[in-house]
Each structure stands twice: as C-alpha cells, then as structure tokens.
C-alpha cells in the first residue's frame, strides 16, 4: 500500500511567491513619469516576474514633519487620484497581483512616526487601515517601526483590524534593526506579522556566517512563516557586490518563507553606478534612454530590455527562480534542512512529502570549491541520493538537466546550484 500523503498546509497568497516593492513611483517609472496611471501600464512587466504582490508607496499626502498636513486617506495628487488607484487595483486583480499599501506616515520627514505625537498618528493609521481595506487593498506595510514607541502593541492592534476584515489580508512591518532579539520581540506578540529587517544584511558574504544566521533565525521563529530580504526598503546592491547577486537571488527564492525584493533587484540596479541617482531610489533602467543625464552611461546589459533578450542575464535567472518558487510544492511549503558542505559553502534541502525535492548549494567564496556534502547531518526523511539533476546554476556553462554526482560536486567562485531529485520511499 502506498504511504498516505501528508496533509497540505493552509496557503495564503503571500506564501506562494515573491513580493515586489515599489517605494518610489517616480523613480520606478522614470523621469517625467511617476503616477498610478503609469504604474498600471507596468503591471504586465510585474506579471512577467511572476511576483504575487506589489508593495506600493507610500503615496499618501505627507508634508514633511507636519502631522496636521499628513493625510493617510488622501493620495498625494502628484501620484494621481483615488480613481486612478481603484483602476490600478482592478487591473492588478485581473493579473492576480495583490496590492499592499505602505502607510508609513511621515515618509518624507526626519522621523517616520512623528516621535512627539504617537497616539494621534496611531489613530490615523487605524482609520487608514479601515478605509483602504474597504477600498480593496490586500494588505499594508509600515516601515521604521523601531521609531514607533510601543510598536508591538500598535502592530497587534493593526493586525487585528487587518485580519478582522479578512484572514487573506497581510500586514508587513519593516525595521532597520539586524538584532535577532529585537526582531523576535516584535514577532512574539504578532502571530501572522511578516517582518522585513536588516537581519541578513551583515551576512558578511561567507557561507558559514550566512548558514548560521539563517538557521538561527529559523530555529528562533519556530513554525511561523518568515520573509527574506536584506533590508526593509533598499536594493540588494546596497549590501552586496555584483558577483553575489545571483547567489542571493537563488537563496532568497529557495529559503522557506516569502522573498521580498525592491524594484531593480531583478536587474542588479545599483544607484552607485549612476551619478545623481540616490541610494534610496535610483531610476529604474527600462532601456538605455532611462538615464539621459550622461549619454552612454547605461549599457544594454544594465537594462530590463537588454536583459530580457539575454537568457543568461540576472533578470532571466530571477524569472526562472520566481516561476519555480511559485509552482513546486517543496519550495512553496517544504521542510528545510541545512547541512555541512565544507568551508565557504551553505547547502540545504527543501522537501515536501513525496514531491520532487531540491538541493541548494551556495559558494560564497571567491575560489572554486569541492563540496563535501555531509548527508549524515540530515534526518532520514531528507536523505541525499548519489546523483541529482541540475535545474540551474547561477553561472553560465553548465549543462542543465544533466545528472551530477553529489560526491564529486565542484562549484565555481560565487556559484550557486539548484538541483532536483525525486522522492525515494
């Protein structure tokens, strides 16, 4: 008799793939543009990335550091009207893209939460949650919560409002903190909160340290659903050298939880490469004309257009990983087991019941390495086969689909491998 199938866990929409942050509409759309109507025209692009949710804004009225002139119910006219927003919501829904609205109140000011008028601001947020839930948004984000006094209790209250409306609504909180204890204290009183932080930002680009950070986090958070990113708002290139971008994409898409990216992460957008562009929100490079300030500054391989035409590009890798993440049971909600693979490497298995299983091996170092996969670290339910098929490598040159002997696995500098193998009873 065949073994009984394991019962599938309840899956919320944010469990099924990545979230994509567009914090600055104008930078995302390019000079001379930057409104909700224009964003509607970019939804097909978001669909092509197979992201499940768009984290938008803030887009509300906010006069810097002025509580009275901050209205969380009103869209800043520079971004468009409530009608434009409704139209965007409708279009996004048709494309199965959920919309999460950032309600960080004083987003243009010195302190995101107007440090002196916490209760007034908290009431404004409460009213805004109810208003925008009625308008049809799928969730909310609030950032810089380390600046919000009594953050845990406010988050619990906002979570109740959000979940009270529908279990299918999401609340994301963002913090600049990278301290695990601070992060855990924010999480412990808020069961379903998705928290983005700087926890992984000091992973130091070594396999051992990254492995230790990831496993500590997963052990500390237990069975709760995690999110994975390097910060609450910034681009991956703010933290990583270019040669590690592919590796981190592979890792973020295959860890158990929701990967969260900022616009431009999929093409390796780097503000530091573009004079005059701010770290917070550089202009999105749709094509070579997106940065007209210095003729010739942008080459085709830096742009969406150029990378879309190149199957070996970072964008193509992002699309493939996003696709795998959203359709493979083991990646959607599978168990996670990290194990030793040798110095400089981070490796783990994702598996769910009798479904296809995935092995991830990441070489963070700048020298080629032989992987010594220590299968003895793994439980019996997650044992390794002698061979696994190469689904993809972050480096060009490997023959995809070919079986690789796991005992003889060699990785190039900064290479990540995603391998698949079948369940064996």
């Amino acid at each position: 008799r065949a073994p009984r199938c394991r019962e599938l866990p309840a899956q919320k929409w944010w469990h099924t793939g990545a979230l994509y942050r567009i914090g600055d509409l104008q930078a995302f759309q390019g000079h001379g543009a930057g409104n909700l109507a224009g964003l509607k025209g970019r939804l097909d692009y978001l669909s092509s990335l197979k992201v499940k949710g768009l984290v938008l804004g803030p887009i509300h009225k906010n006069q810097k550091d002025d509580v009275a002139q901050t209205d969380l119910l009103q869209i800043d006219p520079n971004f468009g009207s409530k009608e434009d927003f409704d139209s965007l919501l409708q279009s996004a829904k048709k494309k199965s893209i959920r919309v999460i609205l950032d309600l960080t109140p004083n987003y243009r000011g010195e302190n995101s939460w107007f440090s002196t008028q916490v209760d007034t601001v908290a009431t404004k947020v409460k009213d805004a949650l109810e208003f925008w839930l009625q308008a049809g948004v799928d969730g909310f984000q609030v950032r810089d919560i380390e600046n919000l006094k009594d953050a845990s209790s406010f988050l619990a209250e906002w979570q109740n409002i959000t979940k009270g409306f529908s279990e299918d609504r999401l609340l994301i909180a963002g913090t600049n903190s990278s301290d695990l204890q601070q992060i855990l204290s924010l999480l412990e009183s808020n069961k379903d909160l998705l928290l983005t932080s700087s926890y992984l930002s000091d992973s130091g680009s070594t396999g051992e340290h990254t492995k230790s950070l990831v496993t500590q986090y997963l052990n500390a958070t237990g069975n709760r659903w995690c999110s994975w990113s390097l910060s609450q708002a910034r681009l991956l290139t703010s933290f990583l050298p270019a040669q590690l971008l592919r590796l981190y994409q592979l890792m973020l898409f295959t860890l158990p939880g929701t990967p969260v990216f900022s616009y431009g992460d999929e093409i390796g957008l780097d503000a530091a490469a573009l004079p005059g562009q701010p770290m917070e929100a550089p202009v999105m490079l749709w094509d070579e004309s997106s940065f007209p300030d210095i003729p010739g500054a942008v080459s085709a391989n830096m742009t969406v257009k150029g990378q879309s035409e190149d199957p070996g590009s970072l964008l193509s890798l992002f699309r493939r990983l996003s696709d795998q993440r959203s359709k493979e049971r083991s990646l959607l909600h599978g168990d996670f087991h990290a194990f030793s693979a040798g110095p400089g490497l981070f490796s783990y298995i994702r598996h769910w019941d009798q479904n296809e299983r995935f092995l991830v091996v990441l070489n963070f170092g700048d020298v080629g390495l032989s992987a010594g996969l220590q299968a003895s670290d793994l439980p019996a339910s997650a044992s390794l086969p002698a061979k696994a098929d190469l689904l993809l490598s972050t480096q060009p040159g490997r023959e995809e689909g070919s079986p690789l002997e796991l005992e003889r696995l060699k990785l190039e500098p900064h290479e990540g491998l995603l391998l698949r193998f079948p369940y064996a009873a």
Epitope: H31, K64, N78, E110, A242, G276
Partner: antibody
Amino acid sequence: QVQLVQSGAEVKKPGASVKVSCKASGYTFTSYWMHWVRQAPGQGLEWIGNINPNGGKTNYNERFKNRATMTRDTSTSTVYMELSSLRSEDTAVYFCTREIDWGQGTLVTVSS
Amino acid sequence: EIVLTQSPATLSLSPGERATLACSVSSSVNYIHWVQQKPGQAPRLWIYSTSKLASGVPARFSGSGSGTDFTLTISSLEPEDFAVYYCQQRSSYPYTFGQGTKLEIK
C-alpha cells in the same frame, strides 16, 4: 544647459547662522536630489548631506546632523542649506551639487 | 563610515609621463567615482562607475578596480591634467571622499 547658481560670500560671527542658496535651472528640479559639500581652505571635500526636492526628504552626515538644515522651494527651483552655531572651523567654500554638475561655491567666513 | 585613502598625496610628473593614482576603500564597494578640481574652481565629475569617463574627459584617462582597491590612470600627461583628483564613494551614507591626490608638474 544645467546651471547651479549659488548665493554670494558671507562673513559671520561665531555662534551665528548662515543660509546659503542654490538656484537650479536647465533640468527638472524635482527629479534630482541635491547634495551639499564643503571644502575648508587648503583641505579636501566633505559631504554634508542631501535633499530630495520632491517632498523635502533629507539625509545628513552625522557630523552636521544637529546644525545643518536643508530645505527647498520648488516654486523657484532653489535649495537652501542653513548651518547654525557657527565656529571658526566652519570657514569653507560650500558647494551644491547634483553630482553631475556643481555650483560655483559660496565662501563662508566665520570670524570674530 | 567608509574611509577612502588616496596615494600618493602628491605626485610630481612631467607631461608625457604616465600617472597612476590609487584609492583604497575601508570596506568593499561596487563602484567609486573620481572628481577633478583645479585651483579656484568647483570640482568636476571626471570618472564615474569606476571606469566610465564623464562628458568631455579625454580618452587618455581610465579608471579600474573593484572591491577595496581602485585606480585612476592617465596614459600620457598633458599640461591641463595637472590638478587635484578625489575619489568618492556613494554606496552608503555618509558619502565620503578621499583626501585627494595632487598631481603637479615636475
């Protein structure tokens, strides 16, 4: 073409404040952050901070955080940098820059 | 903050010679920029994104490097090249400059 035109030289007493202006033309003012950089006599360049003309968000170098204030007036495409509690070490040429283009500089002399 | 250290502080060379200016960064960055400044003038963006020449910069200039070590090279010095060159990082706040290398005529 792009021009950043700064206000004229200033002489101030220690403890006073100074407000330097930078009028931009030749590009869309709200599309580019403006930075302030200073250079003491015979010294190198020091970044003070930046401002997003679209909304007024600012970042400051910690060294100047409590003394520098950057503002903007979108109606005149002008950014301002005010430095308070001046001391003799603040004697310098202050530049506004869009990074691609620089203003001509404003000499601020602090002397009793 | 990220500290940039330039060497040498002063480089004395004759026109026609090759100049190599170094910039060492205290922690790894993806790109640096170089600005040129002549006496009594505002600085000018000279090389950006490590190796790209700003508008109007002659092809005898080149930039290279990655991580923590970057170089500006002038293949054959012309009289107008003598100036102070600063490297700058804009990968994290606060943006910082090196202390400058003064390129002077020997």
